[in-house]
C-alpha cells in the first residue's frame, strides 16, 4: 500500500490555444486529468489500472502551480494504491480547457483538450522527487513525482505492513525495510521477551519486564543464584535447594544439634581443658587446685591431708605448710625423731623398730591409718566412685553421689535411658555413655523420631529432560530444576518456538 504523488509546478501556454490550434475564449482556463497505469512499452488508451485524479481549474494559459499540501490542498496530487508497487508505471497527464464550471468528461467538448503527455518507466519507492519537463509545439509542463509507502507500510515495494507497538504482544518500532527493531530491554522474534537483569541466573531466574530477576522455587538472591536451604535449617547451608549441610560442629536434620559444645559455649572454667563427648555433652579436665563439673570450685590444698604423723596443715597463698608435732620434721612431717620407746603409735597401733632402732613403723588397727595410726581411714581416698561419681564421707561409712545416668553403690551401673521407650514411631533405642540415640524408621527423623519427614520424592525420578530433582522436605514434594530450553513442573515441555504460519 502506497501513494504515487504528482506535483504540478508550471504550465506554459503562451498563445492560449487548444491542441487543435484554436484559441481559448477569453483564455484557456486550465485543469488537469491524470491517469496512472501499469507499464506499457507504448502508452495507449485504456483503463487507468493504478488510478485517476483530476484537478480543479488551476490557472489561465500560463501559470505556476502553488504547493498546497500543507493546507490540505490538491498539490501534490495523490494516487493511492493497495497493492505491491511493481517498480514500473505509465503516466498520462492531460491539460483541458474548462469553458464552464462542469469539469466532468461528458460535459466537455472533445476539442477542449489543450495538451496530452504520456511517459513510462521505472520508479523505485523513495522520498526523493523526480523532476521532469514535457514540451510540445505549443505548451510546456514542468512537474515532479515520486512513490512513497502509506503509513505502516515498508519495504522496496510497500508490501510489508508493520505497526509499532508497545504492549505485551510486542515492544518495537519498524525499520525502513519493515523489520522490527526492539525497544531497549526487549528481545525475541516479536520483541515480547524481556531482557532480565544482567547476571540473572539463566535457569533459576526469569523476568516479566526488563532488568528484573524473579526467582524460581528454591532460589533466592538478587540474581537468583543462591539456593534456599531446608525450612528450619539453623546452622547449615545448601548447594542445591532444600538442602541443609551442617556447619562444622553442628548435626541433625536441621543442623540444630550442637556437636561442639566446647567451642560454642566454653563451659570449662579456670583454664581447664574441654573435651566434646557427644551432643550437648562435654568433660572438663581441671588444673591442679580446682574441681567441679566445670572446674568452677577452687580446691584447698589442705583438703588432701598432706601432713603426716599428726601434723596440722595451714593454707598459704602459694600452697600449704605443715606444722609438725614433737618428734617429727620434714615438708610433710614424714621424718621421725622418735623410736618405739616413745610409744608413737596411737589408737592401739603396734610399734615395730627399724634400722636398729633408729626408726620405727606403726601397724594400725582397722579404720585407722597414717604413720602413727593417727588418722581415721578416709574411705574416699581410693576414689571408689566410678563414672565421675562424687565420694562423700559419712562417719564410719562412705557413699557415692552419682552423675546423671548412673546408679549403684559405686555409680558403676548405667541407667538405661531406653527403659522408658523414648523413641517415637517405632524408632530403635540405643544406650550411649552420655544418653541415648534413636534410629528412626523411613519417613521420620529428629532426636526422638518425632518429626515426620519426606520419603525421598525424587526417588521415582519424576523430572524429565535431564532436569535436576530436589526434595522439598517441608511439603513432601519434589522440585525440578529445568535445563535451558525446557519448562513445566517436571521440565516436560520444550520452550515453544513460534509456529510457522502459511502466509
Amino acid at each position: 500500500s502506497g501513494v504515487f504523488q504528482l506535483q504540478l509546478q508550471e504550465f506554459i501556454n503562451e498563445r492560449g490555444v487548444l491542441a487543435s490550434g484554436r484559441p481559448c475564449e477569453p483564455g484557456c482556463r486550465t485543469f488537469f486529468r491524470v491517469c496512472l497505469k501499469h507499464f506499457q512499452a507504448v502508452v495507449s488508451p485504456g483503463p487507468c489500472t493504478f488510478g485517476t485524479v483530476s484537478t480543479p481549474v488551476l490557472g489561465t494559459n500560463s501559470f505556476a502551480v502553488r504547493d498546497d499540501s500543507s493546507g490540505g490542498g490538491r498539490n501534490p496530487l495523490q494516487l493511492p494504491f493497495n497493492f505491491t508497487w511493481p517498480g514500473t508505471f505509465s503516466l498520462i497527464i492531460e491539460a483541458w480547457h474548462a469553458p464552464g464550471d462542469d469539469l466532468r468528461p461528458e460535459a466537455l467538448p472533445p476539442d477542449a483538450l489543450i495538451s496530452k503527455i504520456a511517459i513510462q518507466g521505472s520508479l523505485a519507492v523513495g522520498q526523493n522527487w523526480l523532476l521532469d519537463e514535457q514540451t510540445s509545439t505549443l505548451t510546456r509542463l514542468r512537474y515532479s513525482y515520486r512513490v512513497i509507502c502509506s503509513d505502516n507500510y515498508y519495504g522496496d515495494n510497500c508490501s510489508r505492513l508493520c505497526k509499532k507497538r508497545n504492549d505485551h504482544f510486542g515492544h518495537y518500532v519498524c525499520q525502513p525495510d519493515g523489520n522490527l527493531s526492539c525497544l531497549p530491554g526487549w528481545t525475541g522474534e516479536y520483541c515480547q521477551q524481556p531482557i532480565c537483569l544482567s547476571g540473572c541466573h539463566e535457569q533459576n531466574g526469569y523476568c516479566s519486564k526488563p532488568a528484573e530477576c524473579l526467582c524460581r522455587p528454591g532460589w533466592q538472591g538478587r540474581l537468583c543464584n543462591e539456593c534456599i536451604p531446608h525450612n528450619g535449617c539453623r546452622h547449615g547451608t545448601c548447594s542445591t535447594p532444600w538442602q541443609c549441610t551442617c556447619d562444622e560442629g553442628w548435626g541433625g536434620l536441621f543442623c540444630d544439634q550442637d556437636l561442639n559444645y566446647c567451642t560454642h559455649h566454653s563451659p570449662c572454667k579456670n583454664g581447664a581443658t574441654c573435651s566434646n563427648s557427644g551432643q550437648r555433652s562435654y568433660t572438663c579436665t581441671c588444673r591442679p587446685g580446682y574441681t567441679g563439673v566445670d572446674c568452677e570450685l577452687e580446691l584447698s590444698e589442705c583438703d588432701s591431708n598432706p601432713c603426716r604423723n599428726g601434723g596440722s596443715c595451714k593454707d598459704q597463698e602459694d600452697g600449704y605448710h605443715c606444722l609438725c608435732p614433737p618428734g617429727y620434721y620434714g615438708l610433710h612431717c614424714e621424718h621421725s625423731t622418735l623410736s618405739c620407746a616413745d610409744s608413737p603409735c596411737f589408737n592401739g597401733g603396734s610399734c615395730r623398730e627399724r634400722n636398729q632402732g633408729a626408726n620405727y613403723a606403726c601397724e594400725c588397727p582397722p579404720n585407722f591409718t597414717g604413720s602413727n595410726c593417727e588418722k581415721k581411714v578416709d574411705r574416699c581416698t581410693s576414689n571408689p566412685c566410678a563414672n565421675g561419681g562424687q565420694c562423700l564421707n559419712r562417719g564410719p561409712s562412705r557413699m557415692c553421689r552419682c552423675r546423671p545416668g548412673f546408679t549403684g553403690t559405686y555409680c558403676e551401673l548405667h541407667v538405661s535411658d531406653c527403659a522408658r521407650n523414648p523413641c517415637a514411631h517405632g524408632g530403635t533405642c540405643h544406650d550411649l555413655e552420655n544418653g541415648l540415640m534413636c534410629t528412626c524408621p523411613a519417613g521420620f527423623s529428629g532426636r526422638r523420631c518425632e518429626v515426620r519427614t519426606s520419603i525421598d520424592a525424587c526417588a521415582s525420578s519424576p523430572c524429565f529432560n535431564r532436569a535436576t530433582c530436589y526434595t522439598d522436605l517441608s511439603t513432601d514434594t519434589f522440585v525440578c530444576n529445568c535445563p535451558y530450553g525446557f519448562v513445566g513442573s517436571r521440565c516436560e515441555f520444550p520452550v515453544g518456538l513460534p509456529p510457522s504460519f502459511p502466509w
Epitope: 503509513d151 505502516n152 505492513l161 505497526k163 504492549d167 505485551h168 504482544f169 519448562v487 515441555f493 518456538l497
Partner: antibody, heavy 121, light 106 residues
Framework: EVQLQESGPGLVKPSETLSLTCTVS??????????WGWIRQPPGKGLEWIGD???????YYNPSLKSRVTISVDTSKNQFSLKLSSVTAADTAVYYC?????????????WGQGTLVTVSS | SYELTQPPSVSVSPGQTASITCSGQ??????ASWYQQKPGQSPVLVIY???KRPSGIPERFSGSNSGDTATLTISGTQPMDEADYYC?????????FGYGTKVTVL
C-alpha cells in the same frame, strides 16, 4: 490440534468468588508464542475481554475488572485459571478461554466452547 | 477508555458484498482482528493484523485498516455468513472489542 476446555461451577452466589479453569490439550501452555486469555459475553450482549496470562506468570487485566480479577497458570497441568471476586448479577455471562497469538498480533485463534456462569442466590 | 464502534446491523443479498466498519481513534495505527460468531457457538477468528486470513477462512473475507476505520469485507456473501461480527484491537495492554454487527443475508 490445540483444544481449550473451560470447567467450573455454573452457579455462584452474589458476593462470592467465581472460579473457572481452562485445560489446554494438544499443545503446550508453555509456548512463548501465545498468551492465554479469558473473555466473557453476557446473555444477548457483546464480548468483553477480562485478561490474559503468559506461561511465565505475567498477567494483564481489563482496568474495569482489575480489582476483582486474578488469573494464574499451572504449567505442570497445562491449565490456567480465572478468579473473579465479589460477583453480582452483572457478572452473569458465558465465559470463554482463548489462545491469543503473538504472531497474530494478539488475535485469538483458538477458543473454548464457553461455560455459562449464573450469579444468583 | 478506548472504544470501538460498529454499526448494529448490515443487510446484504446473497452474492453481494457486505462491508462492516469499525471505528476508533487512530485505529489505523493498531492491528485489527475480526471474529465471526454464530448463535450458540464460540467466536471464530476470520481476520488478524488488519488483512490476514487464518488457514481455513474463505478468500471472500478480506480486511483493511487505515485512519480511524477498519473494514471487514465479505464479497460474494453466502447464507452461511449470517452471523454476528466483532472487531477487536489492543489499546496498550488491554483487549478491546467492538459492540458487534449482525449481518443478515436477505
Amino acid at each position: 490440534e490445540v483444544q481449550l476446555q473451560e470447567s467450573g461451577p455454573g452457579l455462584v452466589k452474589p458476593s462470592e468468588t467465581l472460579s473457572l479453569t481452562c485445560t489446554v490439550s494438544g499443545g503446550s501452555i508453555s509456548s512463548s508464542s501465545y498468551y492465554w486469555g479469558w473473555i466473557r459475553q453476557p446473555p444477548g450482549k457483546g464480548l468483553e475481554w477480562i485478561g490474559d496470562i503468559y506461561y511465565t506468570g505475567s498477567t494483564y487485566y481489563n482496568p474495569s475488572l482489575k480489582s476483582r480479577v486474578t488469573i494464574s497458570v499451572d504449567t505442570s497441568k497445562n491449565q490456567f485459571s480465572l478468579k473473579l471476586s465479589s460477583v453480582t448479577a452483572a457478572d452473569t455471562a458465558v465465559y470463554y478461554c482463548a489462545r491469543e497469538g503473538v504472531p497474530l498480533g494478539g488475535g485469538a485463534d483458538k477458543w473454548g466452547q464457553g461455560t455459562l456462569v449464573t450469579v444468583s442466590s | 477508555s478506548y472504544e470501538l464502534t460498529q454499526p448494529p446491523s448490515v443487510s446484504v443479498s446473497p452474492g453481494q458484498t457486505a462491508s462492516i466498519t469499525c471505528s476508533g481513534q487512530r485505529l489505523g495505527d493498531k492491528y485489527a482482528s475480526w471474529y465471526q460468531q454464530k448463535p450458540g457457538q464460540s467466536p471464530v477468528l476470520v481476520i488478524y493484523e488488519d488483512s490476514k486470513r487464518p488457514s481455513g477462512i474463505p478468500e471472500r473475507f478480506s480486511g483493511s485498516n487505515s485512519g480511524d476505520t477498519a473494514t471487514l469485507t465479505i464479497s460474494g456473501t453466502q447464507p452461511m455468513d449470517e452471523a454476528d461480527y466483532y472487531c477487536q484491537a489492543w489499546d496498550r495492554d488491554t483487549g478491546v472489542f467492538g459492540y458487534g454487527t449482525k449481518v443478515t443475508v436477505l
